[in-house]
């Protein structure tokens, strides 16, 4: 007897990160024996949609015209042989942004910071949110989330960087979020470009948590260190 | 031109409702901004009535005192703000302005106002 | 709630005086403060954002500093035209609000 079906792949196009009113593909790439494809969407009747697959049959598209809230969250899509249902794939995160006005990001004592040094990045939110997002630019896996406990709300959250390498210079941008959903995200930040002087052969600075070797630099997550600040955040690594 | 432009003001007797509209132009409601409404009582200080933000979510934050009284909505296809008034008492009467908050968290662009008069 | 003070309330100056209007908030409002002048019949004018910085086409003769919870606006040679009320605020949108502005300084001719 024949195992389960591969499971299919899903992924989103121009990417899974898409501003309010903006369109956006996902795509579900299964077998050439698909018969239909059937997206579902987390806390959404299923199936979400359904497509016939587009030849060579190996794959379908779901297409959103323009972003809005109700299409943020987490989706899988499944494909119909002859032979039954496949596994689903694994999920698709999609995002929206521009659910909340831009936060204003800051570095303290100065975006220009010695290598070794201590730099802490401020993301500021003129109303209470719950979950400040600091993004590297050009970094693949660049989320560092800081999430208020018990749903109390906060004005802004402090990433520290310590010490301070070559690594750490770049252009930053925060997000915030409320508690409504995570898939809605602020309009980004203005830009803070981070520059570190005298940085030549800087040491790395231990990771917090193991990363995986094949990561090169700009792989790596943002390492700050330590402890949460008393605004009652929680650090989460993505 | 960058400008606020109130209206709907008038005289209004006690209990009544009424619809005040701020229409932007030079910028986008839908942009990355809050919108707040303020009043000010003839002689008085300026009072803050609440605020909503441009993200697409609406976000709307009132003050204490509004107890469901006012409620702030936007119609983006037409760059326009409203503040609908219900249960109106004379200490209602006021110029009411609605101002953009810039990127710098202060009230950076203002409307000239509209005077509501609650009388009998 | 943040509740801004203000004071004076009033101030009688003449042409050429240096003038100071203080604005205290209940707890730190880091540097997200700031500063309007309003003539009646008018709309306020924003002078100052983030307590020190003068907004466009203000003159060089109005500053603010403080941060935290203590806050100031001077006036450093007080000319006709800056015969005024003068209001702070802070930058926080909330619920728990009663109000954003201070009480309001009166600067009137001695």
């Known amino acids: 007897q024949a195992g389960p079906l591969p499971k299919p792949t899903l992924w989103a196009e121009p990417g899974s990160v898409i501003s309010w009113g903006n369109s956006v593909t996902i795509w579900c790439q299964g077998t050439l024996e698909a018969r239909e494809y059937r997206l579902d969407k987390e806390e959404s009747p299923a199936p979400w949609d359904r497509q016939n697959p587009l030849e060579p049959k190996n794959k379908a598209r779901f297409s959103i015209p323009s972003m809005t809230e109700d299409y943020a969250g987490r989706y899988r899509c499944y494909y119909r042989s002859p032979v039954g249902w496949s596994q689903p794939s694994d999920p698709l995160e999609l995002v929206m942004t521009g659910a909340y006005s831009k936060p204003t990001l800051s570095a303290l004592p100065s975006p220009l910071v010695t290598s070794g040094k201590s730099v802490t990045l401020l993301c500021q939110s003129r109303s209470p949110m719950d979950t400040f997002l600091l993004i590297k630019e050009r970094a693949a896996h660049p989320l560092l989330h800081l999430r208020s406990e018990h749903g109390a709300q906060q004005h802004q959250a402090e990433f520290p960087m310590s010490p301070v390498t070559s690594v750490h210079g770049g252009t930053y941008r925060c997000f915030s979020s409320h508690g409504f959903s995570h898939y809605l995200l602020s309009h980004p930040s203005d830009p803070l470009e981070l520059i570190v002087s005298g940085s030549l052969e800087d040491p790395r600075p231990s990771p917090t948590r193991s990363v995986s070797t094949a990561a090169g630099p700009e792989d790596q997550p943002l390492m700050p260190t330590g402890s949460v600040p008393h605004s009652g955040l929680r650090r989460h690594w993505e | 031109e960058v400008q606020l432009v109130e209206s709907g003001g008038g005289l209004v007797q006690p209990g009544g409702s009424l619809r005040l509209s701020c229409a932007a132009s030079g910028f986008s409601l839908s942009s990355s901004y809050w919108i707040s409404w303020v009043r000010q009582a003839p002689g008085k200080g300026l009072e803050w009535i609440g605020s909503?933000?441009?993200?697409?979510?609406?976000?709307?934050y009132y003050a204490t005192w509004v107890k469901g009284r006012f409620t702030i909505s936007r119609d983006n296809s037409k760059n326009t703000l409203y503040l609908q008034m219900n249960s109106l008492r004379a200490e209602d009467t006021a110029v009411y302005y609605c101002a953009r908050h810039g990127d710098n968290w202060a009230l950076d662009l203002w409307g000239q106002g509209t005077l509501v008069t609650v009388s009998s | 709630d943040i509740q801004m003070t203000q004071s004076p309330s009033t101030l009688s100056a003449s042409v050429g005086d240096r003038v100071t209007i203080t604005c205290r908030a209940s707890?730190?409002?880091?540097?997200?403060l700031a500063w309007y002048q309003q003539k009646p019949g008018k709309a306020p004018k924003l002078l100052i954002y983030k307590a020190s910085t003068l907004a466009s086409g203000v003159p060089s003769r109005f500053s603010g500093s403080g941060s935290g919870t203590e806050f100031t606006l001077t006036i450093s040679s007080l000319q006709p035209d800056d015969f005024a009320t003068y209001y702070c605020?802070?930058?926080?949108?909330?619920?728990?609000?009663?109000?954003?502005f201070g009480g309001g300084t009166k600067v009137e001719i001695k």
């Open positions: 707890q730190s409002i880091q540097s997200w």
């Open positions: 605020q802070h930058g926080y949108i909330r619920g728990d609000l009663d109000n954003v």
């Open positions: 909503i933000d441009s993200g697409s979510v609406g976000i709307t």
